[in-house]
């Protein structure tokens, strides 16, 4: 016996289909109608048939009560080949839904997606993360799904993208945008950022995630966000190979004063990093391969420091720098 | 047998910020249900503040919304409760709670705010 | 928001008499054919604890006394024969759309 494909636990809270099967049933997806956080994983299948048994260019005003029903507050679809028409009529369904974050992962949109119609209502995701996710339309992607979004989103995640740059004109401004989250895509590169980080489209973010995005310096990252326009309170750059000393010939960087958060971590560094802001919060230069305890000079002022998880500390060492959280136990870097 | 326990201090200065720790037992935080923080000022009724989902998805009243965060440590089977600038009003009996049918509560810890 | 409004605020009754406690909701906390809408009782000084979930399925280890019923917007928690230690406040919940809210409290004691 097949085992069923969609699960629903006993509160009604997380429902999660897998569809493995040639010819699935899709029908029993709808024993996830009464979840909260609903999963459906369509095993690879494409879905270009489906345009055959639905009315894409249905007024989805008629599904708007049946919609409403849903408690469906976070959604994931993933491995799936999707037509563009298909994810557009699926979003302007949602639309009148309550869903508020949205996964895509493992997805190969197909084709164009249509503009949003003059009476369409947008979706009014506060997060949208995706990955894996390639699409036909190359770099005018994020303009073209963009368009189908109520301007409030407030978290934004692209990993594994084959292609994170934007087309930046396209792209129309995130106002609420508080959370870029970039990490996992190690061909992004300092250069690439700058492509992504499309210039004053990204006025509000506070945190800003480039974990294994290829970034080499801590000042090639300084000059990136500088060119764009963005001012981030946090920013993530552990797992990367980071190199300690700049390129001489380079400009010298000033960071916003707003960066109070730096995550170092996990960079490969043998040294404190030139470049660094003046003052900090909070700085994590934790599983690096230290060989020292850094220099006062060498470190900005900052209240939270972590280096645990360094070659130089050996539990029980007096801590290297006031104000610093080391554990004196070294963590599995 | 899942079990929930409250920790944190039992008097907040007035304008601080209110922080509280639930630690779970008999069941993992992110492999399944919400994780809630639900309170209950003297001789009043319920109020839910918010929750935490196994996928780390929060969701929070409105009416504290600007107030509050709910965050997690998976590693110790915790999550945790943050409320700022808080007044009198504030003062309550915090229960962390499981699912949004609470099925299993905390024995709540009162929490005073007052100079 | 949805407005849960318990009926009567405080009841005194007989120790074996039925008791019925209403709760109205501003809208209806139905998603398609499930209400989620629950019962709970507090002693002071304690949690709340789940009596009936779902409007009417009654929770693992509750006296059979307690049951539920209603749909939408109605619906009513009914103790068949009062005991002694049903002294305590009923609160009913909902959990259809968020914020998920609580009735203002019933207050049952007896007689």
């Known amino acids: 016996t097949t085992p069923e494909p969609c699960e629903l636990d006993d509160e009604d809270f997380r429902c999660v289909c897998n569809f493995s099967e040639p010819q699935p049933d899709w029908s029993e997806a709808f024993q996830c109608v009464s979840a909260v956080e609903v999963e459906i994983h369509a095993g690879g299948l494409n879905l270009e048939p489906f345009l055959k048994r639905v009315d894409a260019d249905a007024d989805p005003r008629q599904y708007a009560d049946t919609v409403k029903a849903l408690r469906v507050r976070r959604l994931t679809v993933g491995a799936a080949q999707v037509p563009a028409q298909l994810l557009v009529g699926a979003l302007r369904v949602l639309a009148y839904s309550r869903l508020k974050e949205l996964t895509l992962e493992d997805l190969k949109i197909t084709g164009t997606m249509p503009p949003l119609p003059l009476e369409a209502t947008g979706l009014a995701l506060s997060s949208l993360r995706l990955r894996n996710v390639s699409w036909a339309t190359g770099r005018s992607w994020l303009a073209e799904l963009q368009q189908w979004l109520k301007p409030g989103l407030k978290v934004l995640s692209i990993a594994q993208a084959h292609s994170p740059a934007f087309s930046c004109e396209q792209v129309r401004a995130f106002p609420a945008l508080t959370s870029l989250d970039l990490s996992d895509n190690p061909g992004l590169g300092e250069r690439g950022l700058m492509a992504a980080l499309c210039p004053h489209k990204f006025p509000a973010i506070q945190n800003l995630a480039l974990r294994n995005t290829g970034m080499e310096t801590p000042t090639g990252v300084c000059a990136a966000l500088a060119a764009a326009g963005v001012q981030p309170h946090s920013l993530d750059l552990s797992h990367n190979s980071l190199r300690a000393t700049v390129n001489p010939s380079a400009p010298r960087c000033m960071w916003s004063s707003a960066l109070n958060s730096l995550n170092l971590s996990f960079a490969g560094l043998e040294q404190v990093p030139k470049g660094l802001p003046a003052k900090l919060r909070v700085l994590d230069l934790s599983c690096n391969r230290l060989n020292r305890a850094p220099q006062p000079d060498e470190l900005p002022e900052v209240d939270n420091l972590t280096l645990d998880g360094n070659p130089f500390l050996v539990p029980g060492t007096a801590l290297p720098h006031e104000g610093s959280m080391n554990s004196g136990v070294v963590p599995a870097c | 047998q899942l079990q929930l326990q409250e920790s944190g201090p039992g008097l907040v200065k007035p304008s601080e910020t209110l922080s509280l720790t639930c630690t779970v037992s008999g069941g993992s935080i992110s492999s399944d249900s919400a994780w809630n923080w639900i309170r209950q000022p003297p001789g009043k009724g319920l109020e839910w503040i918010g929750y935490i989902s196994y996928s780390g998805s929060t969701s929070y009243n409105p009416s504290l919304k600007s107030r509050v965060t709910i965050s997690r440590d998976t590693s110790k089977n915790q999550f945790s409760l943050k409320l700022s600038s808080v007044t009198a009003a504030d003062t309550a009996v915090y229960y962390c709670v499981r699912g949004l049918r609470f099925a299993y509560w905390g024995q709540g810890t009162l929490v005073t705010v007052s100079s | 928001d949805i407005q849960l409004t318990q009926s009567p605020s405080s009841l005194s009754a007989s120790v074996g008499d039925r008791v019925t406690i209403t709760c109205r909701a501003s809208e209806s906390v139905d998603s398609y054919v499930t209400s989620f809408l629950h019962w709970y009782q507090q002693k002071p000084g304690k949690a709340p604890k789940l009596l009936i979930y779902?409007?009417?399925n009654l929770q693992s280890g509750v006296p059979s006394r307690f049951s539920g019923s209603g749909s939408r917007t109605d619906f009513t928690l009914t103790i068949s024969s009062l005991q002694p230690e049903d002294v305590a406040t009923y609160y009913c919940?909902?959990?259809?759309?968020?914020?998920?809210?609580f009735g203002q409290g019933t207050k049952l004691e007896i007689k």
């Open positions: 779902r409007a009417s």
């Open positions: 919940q909902q959990s259809n759309e968020d914020p998920y809210t």
